[in-house]
């Protein structure tokens, strides 16, 4: 299964948590470690190559999915207008 | 929900748009596809689109077959129709499920009902 | 381009049987297989997924099984309900996907 290793959560500022967090999976050729259904998932390398973070599908069902600006990561939208934000680095 | 609309006769050779209206999810949170059924015949792959628009097309259906989207619908262009491409269209969403090891799977989870297109001269 | 072998074209079972159809793909496609039933004038609706997860909502009496190239739905104790064509879809989205031809599952 994939490895999750948390390697820092900044929980002092109110109503927002900041976690970095690393995955590790075991991928079929052609894929990489991502986030599929806010879950660790091997994803299709193409996806990873073009910062097309939207199409590993990262958030969850009911959700929307917008990318950030250059492509740095995307935002998942719950229907109430919360709004989660994940960067890559 | 998923809405199939556009299906009608036509003569072959002309060009006919199909729309999927979903409804109840976003767009940007799924894999879209069609897939066409002959009249007494099986499943045929058509294409898909991802959630940033690219698109993926069975080898048969390149060149003449174009998925696009908006927020809210995905078209289905088709062009230089043949009695052949007689059929029920169907749209179909796609969520990932993921299995043992991370490995991810296509799951074709909501099917529309599907638009009757008759190509006849 | 991915194909997919799917057999029997058609069975017929008598309510509890276990009814087995099978899909063989022409490479290796990592589980990467759902399974489909279709009743006349109806949309397919979704079975298994991942070669062996069953759908939420589905009787448990379905299942899904096999790995590489060689895959099977089971029906276990089939019902008469159970009447409608099923197809497998193997492949992945980010490359070929195709369907199997479909299996005709007739209840006596």
């Known amino acids: 299964t994939c490895e999750i290793v948390t390697l820092d959560r900044d929980s002092s500022q109110p109503r927002r948590t900041i976690a970095r967090q690393t995955a590790r999976c075991a991928c079929r050729k052609g894929q990489i470690a991502g986030t599929t259904r806010a879950r660790p998932a091997c994803v299709d390398a193409r996806i990873i190559k073009t910062k097309q973070w939207c199409d590993m599908l990262p958030c969850l069902e009911g959700e929307g999915c917008d990318l950030l600006i250059n492509r740095s990561g995307w935002t998942c939208t719950q229907p109430g207008g919360r709004i989660k934000t994940t960067t890559v680095s | 929900s998923l809405e199939e609309s556009g299906g009608r006769l036509v003569t072959p050779g002309t060009p006919l748009t199909l729309t999927c209206t979903a409804s109840?999810?976003?767009?940007?949170?799924?894999?879209m596809g069609w897939v066409r059924q002959a009249p007494g015949e099986g499943l045929e792959w058509i294409g898909i689109?991802?959630?940033?628009?690219s698109t993926y097309y069975a080898s048969w259906a390149k060149g003449r077959f174009t998925i696009s989207k908006t927020s809210t619908t995905v078209d289905l262009k088709m062009t230089s129709l043949t009695t052949e491409d007689t059929a029920t269209y169907f749209c179909?969403?796609?969520?990932?499920?993921?299995?043992?090891?991370?490995?991810?799977?296509?799951?074709?989870?909501?099917w529309g009902q599907g638009t009757l297109v008759t190509v006849s001269s | 381009e991915l194909d997919m072998t799917q057999t029997p074209p058609s069975l017929s079972a008598s309510v509890g049987e276990t009814v087995r159809i099978r899909c063989l793909a022409s490479?290796?496609?990592?589980?990467?297989i759902s399974w489909y039933q279709q009743k006349p004038g109806k949309p397919p609706t979704l079975l298994i997924y991942?070669?062996?997860n069953l759908e939420s909502g589905v009787p448990p009496r379905f299942s899904g099984s096999g790995s590489g190239t060689d895959y099977t739905l089971t029906i276990g104790g089939v019902q008469a309900e159970d009447a409608a064509t099923y197809y497998c879809?193997?492949?992945?989205?980010?490359?070929?996907?195709?369907f199997g031809a479909g299996t005709n599952v007739e209840i006596k």
């Open positions: 179909a969403r796609i969520d990932i499920g993921v299995g043992d090891y991370g490995w991810a799977y296509d799951r074709l989870d909501l």
């Open positions: 109840g999810f976003s767009l940007s949170n799924y894999y």
């Open positions: 689109i991802y959630a940033s628009g």
């Open positions: 490479e290796d496609i990592y589980s990467g």
């Open positions: 991942g070669a062996s």
């Open positions: 879809l193997g492949g992945y989205s980010y490359s070929s996907i195709t």
